[in-house]
């Protein structure tokens, strides 16, 4: 014959552990119901009462079943620099990441606390790995033979183009000028442009990440004014 | 008593590979954010890199692509998987814990530090 | 990646003395920045963090200020103690140390 289920609350068999979506109660040494997500436990059990429930409170949540007294406070809102990319409901807080042309340069746990707004490479200078999510990115200078003109977070340098008469040679931060009509190479018109950082969680994630343990907060405060790194510009 | 301890140092020739070890007691490392700190002889300390509770990591550029930083949840281990080692990469290698928080990367617990040096 | 700058890099001072380090970020860090002292053999020790917040079981004589790009550890007065090597960290997902200050006996 099976077992008799037991309801909650309920006296374990010593040695035992209790239920999934239970647990033990060392004041009432009883198992007892967890609330769902999106609530907290309002009444703990009682040797004869089970957990009373209560739903979470506007701008708070549970994210797991839990026997929390009140539910955790969901981060403050997404500062200007970024984007609202999970809201804040009675079940998930709300996560914040940076805006295109930012980088998230502190984040212990789910979303950004902090935003900077990517390096820019100046003229004779040329992106040598790209910004990510998690990664600002690094200019690098120009090699001999390649050259960009543009202050960005994105351009390469760029090959000169090869002239038959050469009227004014290329250098770092200019391409060659050619007298003749038309060179006899030249790179299509317009810059070169790496991709966006493509909104990965960081740029090194493991094959299978652990799950977080610690509820997440998602505030940002104003970074100040910084001043330009070796190739790169504020602007 | 809570602590950390490190583990696995020692001799190794240029472009050998080693791993260390920190073991936690007294804490479940899975409810904290780690990292590894190096410190050369005679020099100061330089980070390493560091792994978030949902197993995400970040290193030193000089780190990218050599050091590993990894962790067995059913050992309350951390380790540090290095490899192509460099005579610059002698020095005392410590792990430390996160203070908590999803603030900034601090470390208020640290293990006593493990040699490892690295020579023909 | 950002560049963390102490100085002085040693400082000599007497027991009883008000000692103030400084530590300069190649850009603005808010207020995340720890301050460690550590001894010879030693792991560091944490003291501040997040600029200005005491770590549990510091003395209240240390103390620390800023934001942005400038930052100070101040020892209202000096202990036999106190003396050793202090470093600055920022803490940003990339974490960097200042070079440190070694503070010794006058």
């Known amino acids: 014959l099976p077992a008799q289920v037991a309801f909650t609350p309920y006296a374990p068999e010593p040695g035992s552990t209790c239920r999934l979506r239970e647990y033990y109660d060392q004041t009432a040494q009883m198992c007892c119901s967890k609330c769902s997500p999106g609530q907290h436990a309002k009444v703990f059990c009682t040797k004869t009462s089970d957990t009373v429930c209560d739903s979470c409170e506007d701008s708070t949540y549970t994210q797991l079943w839990n026997w929390v007294p009140e539910c955790l406070s969901c981060g403050s809102r997404c500062s200007s620099d970024q984007v609202e990319t999970q809201a804040c409901t009675r079940e998930q807080n709300r996560i914040c990441t940076c805006r295109p042309g930012w980088y998230c340069a502190l984040s212990k746990q789910e979303g950004c606390r902090l935003c900077a707004p990517l390096r820019k490479c100046r003229p004779g200078f040329g992106v040598a790995r790209p910004g990510t999510e998690t990664s600002d990115v690094v200019c690098k200078p120009c090699a001999p033979g390649t050259f960009s003109n543009t202050t960005s977070s994105t351009d390469i340098c760029r090959p000169h183009q090869i002239c038959n008469v050469v009227a004014i040679p290329g250098n770092a931060s200019m391409d060659a000028v050619c007298t003749s009509t038309s060179p006899t190479r030249s790179m299509a018109p317009g810059a070169v442009h790496l991709p966006q950082p493509v909104s990965t969680r960081s740029q090194h994630t493991q094959p299978t990440p652990e799950p977080s343990t610690a509820p997440s907060t998602s505030f940002l405060l104003p970074m100040g004014p910084s001043p330009p790194a070796e190739g790169s510009t504020g602007d | 008593e809570v602590q950390l301890v490190e583990s696995g140092g020692g001799l190794v020739q240029p472009g050998g590979s080693l791993r260390l070890s920190c073991a936690a007691s007294?804490?479940?490392?899975?409810?904290?954010?780690m990292g590894w700190v190096r410190q050369a002889p005679g020099k100061g300390l330089e980070w390493v890199g560091s792994?978030?509770?949902?197993?995400?990591?970040y290193y030193a550029n000089w780190a990218e692509g050599r050091f590993t930083i990894s962790r067995d949840n059913s050992k309350n281990t951390l380790y540090l998987q290095m490899n192509s080692l460099r005579a610059e990469d002698t020095a005392v290698y410590y792990c430390?814990?996160?203070?908590?928080?999803?603030?900034?990367?601090?470390?208020?617990?640290w293990g006593q530090g493990t040699l490892v040096t690295v020579s023909s | 990646d950002i560049q963390m700058t102490q100085s002085p890099s040693t400082l000599s001072a007497s027991v009883g003395d008000r000692v103030t380090i400084t530590c300069q970020a190649s850009?603005?860090?808010?207020?995340?920045l720890a301050w460690y002292q550590q001894k010879p053999g030693k792991a560091p020790k944490l003291l501040i963090y997040?600029?200005?917040k005491l770590a549990s079981g510091v003395p209240s004589r240390f103390s620390g200020s800023g934001s942005g790009t400038e930052f100070t550890l101040t020892i209202s007065s000096l202990q036999p103690d106190d003396f050793a090597t202090y470093y600055c960290?920022?803490?940003?997902?990339?974490?960097?140390f200042g070079g440190g200050t070694k503070v010794e006996i006058k």
């Open positions: 430390g814990r996160d203070v908590g928080g999803d603030g900034g990367w601090y470390f208020n617990l």
């Open positions: 007294g804490i479940d490392l899975s409810n904290y954010a």
């Open positions: 792994r978030r509770t949902d197993g995400i990591t």
């Open positions: 850009q603005s860090i808010n207020i995340y």
């Open positions: 997040d600029a200005s």
């Open positions: 960290q920022q803490g940003i997902n990339n974490i960097g």
